[in-house]
């Protein structure tokens, strides 16, 4: 019986010769747990593991800690890959994070962090980022230094309020901070002056809820 080939991320899938965009099964080394992830094999040389996508409001992102831990949604559409998988993956080697954004006027922008990882669940999946470049703002819209992850049932933010309940969605909230890509999805012409929308302040300013977002990771030096 031949040994089954497994891939830890989309970069490994790409290097194995699978260079078509789509959903692939990923497995961490020394683990039997599988996740389904969308692989972008075209953008910027390919090999990108999509860890979050918003595009049409079809999936509810106001989820529990456990749901954000294991992931939810549809990898071909709107989804969250899962904090536990991303934490384990990004602590095995160095990863870059690219965040691609779309507004309702047909514009696109990105933020690229040269080093990204999440702490363990015991440390509330705190986000760690370094080295920002890109067109979606010269200042990071994810508060620096990174915050713990919060959900509607796990209040780990720095606010006297409960940011996840107030703004909806799980995120690395500060109090509450310049971004929330897991906020409420608002359609065109209803997407301004929103207190709980899909926010990336240093690109579109306050209250503007975006049309689309993608968070993707790839090993540094790919």
């Amino acid at each position: 019986k031949g040994e089954q080939i497994s891939f830890r991320d989309c970069a490994e899938v790409f290097k194995s010769g699978h260079t078509t965009n789509g959903v692939y099964t990923l497995t961490l080394p020394n683990s039997t747990e599988e996740v389904k992830a969308y692989c972008d094999m075209e953008a910027g040389g390919g090999g990108w593991t999509i860890i979050q996508r918003r595009e049409d409001g079809s999936v509810d992102f106001q989820r529990t800690w456990k749901e954000y831990k294991v992931g939810f949604g549809n990898p071909s559409g709107e989804y969250w890959l899962g904090n536990e998988f991303v934490s384990q993956l990004t602590n095995q080697q160095r990863y870059v994070l690219k965040i691609h954004l779309k507004d309702w006027e047909g514009n696109e922008a990105y933020s690229l962090y040269e080093h990204f990882y999440l702490s363990s669940e015991e440390l509330n999946y705190r986000i760690h980022l370094k080295g920002l470049t890109g067109t979606a703002g010269k200042i990071s819209s994810i508060s620096q230094p990174g915050n713990d992850f919060s959900t509607k049932d796990a209040d780990n933010d720095k606010c006297i309020c409960k940011c996840s309940q107030m703004l909806t969605g799980g995120w690395w909230f500060d109090a509450c901070g310049p971004s929330n890509l897991n906020g409420m999805y608002y359609p065109q012409r209803q997407n301004t002056n929103k207190f709980n929308g899909i926010k990336w302040y240093y690109w579109k300013g306050s209250g503007y809820s975006l049309k689309g977002t993608t968070m993707m990771i790839r090993p540094a030096g790919f």
Epitope: K158, C159, I160, C161, C163, M166, D174, A175, C176, G177, P178, N193, K194, F195, G197, K199, Y201, S206, G207
Partner: nanobody, 129 residues
Framework: EVQLVESGGGLVQPGGSLRLSCAVS????????IGWFRQAPGKEREGVSA????????YYADSVKGRFTISSDNSKNTVYLQMNSLRPEDTAVYYC??????????????????????WGQGTLVTVSS
């Protein structure tokens, strides 16, 4: 839908006064803080003053302390900025904006500009002789 509409701007001589109004709809002032911001040509938007109606707390930038007074009329859902002893450097477009009152960092009293998610279109204040 949240809306903020500023009015009261205009041309005034140095040393003169103006009262700006911010009419708010779609939210109640009891639950929100309202801030006044200004943006002069070629400069970044800066905070001028803010008020939390629920507790009566107010904030003023150092540059306007003693000259500007912020107040609110909850029955009219309107916030006012009384501007006295105006100077040429006060010339700018003035905006009002809203933030949920509870969106405060532990130990802080006021809010960074990025927490204000609802904005008006602005009213122009020109101080010139």
């Amino acid at each position: 839908e949240v809306q903020l509409v500023e009015s009261g701007g205009g041309l005034v001589q140095p040393g003169g006064s103006l009262r700006l109004s911010c009419a708010v709809s779609g939210i109640t002032l009891d639950d929100y803080a309202i801030g006044w911001f200004r943006q002069a040509p070629g400069k970044e938007r800066e905070g001028v003053s803010a008020i939390r109606s629920s507790g009566g707390s107010t904030y003023y930038a150092d540059s306007v302390k003693g000259r500007f007074t912020i107040s609110s009329d909850n029955s009219k859902n309107t916030v006012y900025l009384q501007m006295n002893s105006l100077r040429p450097e006060d010339t700018a477009v003035y905006y009002c904006a809203a933030v949920p009152a509870g969106r405060l960092r532990y130990g802080e009293q006021w809010y960074p500009i990025y927490e204000y998610d609802a904005w008006g279109q602005g009213t122009l204040v020109t101080v010139s002789s």
